[in-house]
């Protein structure tokens, strides 16, 4: 009976999310394998988040709006492990917007989700950021490694969206 009611709850939750995400990919987790964590298909999952690589070339503002429409934000990178996971799925000859910007050019970098900007957990390429005119951050492959660079916000780039996993 308990299992039945849990299944019914899950199904109603799935139906609720169905209007936003036509397809969800879910995995069982938790100590009793009772919880399901889901990401929209074909998003990828890492820890408690889902990631989507958009190959549509858009400005930073339009990229953030695009993520927002999907219930996400441009990616906020909190650890080296997270960055290493993300970059596995990126093309080395492309650049991708991050959810990191300096809208006033004061070198006060800010994440879109208001996560505090921690200088100790940043992955700027050597010599970057290097221009107060360049107020948005990308991740790209340079000098044999992935890192961040500041660029003009209105120059179209690919982008990475991030959202919290859906738990049902």
């Amino acid at each position: 009976n308990f299992m039945y009611s849990k299944t019914v709850k899950r199904l109603s939750k799935l139906q609720e999310y169905q209007q936003y995400y036509p397809s969800l990919t879910c995995v069982m987790e938790g100590k009793d394998m009772e919880d399901w964590s889901c990401c929209p298909t074909p998003w990828t999952s890492f820890q408690s988040s889902c990631y989507f690589i958009s190959t549509v070339m858009q400005s930073w503002t339009k990229s953030q709006n695009n993520c927002s429409v999907m219930g996400a934000d441009l990616v906020v990178i909190n650890t080296k492990e997270e960055q290493d996971f993300i970059t596995q799925n990126l093309k080395i000859n492309s650049a991708y917007f991050l959810g990191l910007s300096d809208p006033k050019g004061w070198r006060h970098w800010q994440w879109v989700d208001q996560t505090p900007y921690n200088k100790n957990v940043t992955f700027w390429h050597s010599g970057e950021p290097n221009s107060p005119d360049e107020r948005c951050a990308i991740i790209n492959f340079r000098s044999e490694e992935w890192g961040w660079n500041d660029v003009h916000c209105h120059v179209p780039q690919k982008s990475i969206c991030k959202m919290k996993k859906i738990y049902i």
Epitope: S59, W60, T61, G105, S131, D133, R135, H152, H154, P156
Partner: antibody, heavy 121, light 111 residues
Framework: EVQLLESGGGLVQPGGSLRLSCAAS????????MSWVRQAPGKRLEWVAT????????YYPDSVKGRFTISRDNSKNTLYLQMNSLRAEDTAVYYC??????????????WGQGTTVTVSS | DIVLTQSPDSLAVSLGERATINCKAS??????????VNWYQQKPGQPPKLLIY???NLESGIPDRFSGSGSGTDFTLTISSLQAEDVAVYYC?????????FGGGTKVEIK
């Protein structure tokens, strides 16, 4: 007083090359992102190229990508536009302009007087 | 590309009267409370001159008879009391996304 002086325009045959220069004074040139904008006779203004202050990032519209190259020499306070494989539709007055950011966008605040490029056989 | 359509193509206004120029973008050029549209004035044989940035901010040194308004896709440049020296072509421009694009221009003359 800010002054931007373009030079290097002239008459060139289709397929030919030309190098435009823009000498800047009255500004700390090395701190400015710079752009080229052109205006064909009777047509609207068209953005052609942008280069950041350090010269390591350059941007172009599809109409000139692969044919035009923007560069700068901060020691000489000079901006350049190398134009190759010129076409009749590249005929225009070419202006250099300083770029000023505005949040996530920008404005072109100071403009030179322009130099005329005519592509014709 | 974002297309900017200006109207009217030309405008004849009496001295001291109001002139209004419209600019319509093919998609929104707003983000987080700012609009990325600028207005320029170009007199014959001269380069363009920045008048208004961010849709409504008056550039330093520009007379306050010039004003800008609008958001999203619809923007307006107003000259509250036309002076003889305002005879020129006026262009809107968007800087929200490359390639930067300009409107086709509006020629303002004296009636």
């Amino acid at each position: 007083e800010v002054q931007l002086l373009e030079s290097g325009g002239g008459l060139v045959q289709p397929g030919g090359s030309l190098r435009l220069s823009c000498a800047a004074s009255g500004i700390t040139f090395s701190t400015y992102t710079m752009s080229w904008v052109r205006q064909a006779p009777g047509k609207r203004l068209e953005w052609v190229a942008t280069i950041n202050s350090g010269g390591d990032n350059t941007y172009y519209p599809d109409s000139v990508k692969g044919r035009f190259t923007i560069s700068r020499d901060n020691s000489k306070n000079t901006l350049y536009l190398q134009m190759n494989s010129l076409r009749a539709e590249d005929t225009a007055v070419y202006y250099c302009a300083t770029y000023r950011p505005y949040y996530y966008g920008s404005v072109l605040d100071y403009w030179g007087q322009g130099t005329t490029v005519t592509v014709s056989s | 590309d974002i297309v900017l359509t200006q109207s009217p193509d030309s405008l004849a206004v009496s001295l001291g009267e109001r002139a209004t120029i419209n600019c319509k973008a093919s998609q929104s050029v707003d983000y987080d409370g700012n609009s990325y549209v600028n207005w320029y004035q170009q007199k014959p044989g001269q380069p363009p001159k920045l008048l208004i940035y961010g849709a409504s901010n008056l550039e330093s040194g520009i007379p306050d008879r010039f004003s800008g308004s609008g958001s999203g896709t619809d923007f307006t440049l107003t000259i509250s009391s036309l002076q003889a020296e305002d005879v020129a072509v006026y262009y809107c421009q968007q800087s929200d996304e490359d390639p930067w694009t300009f409107g086709g221009g509006t020629k303002v003359e004296i009636k």
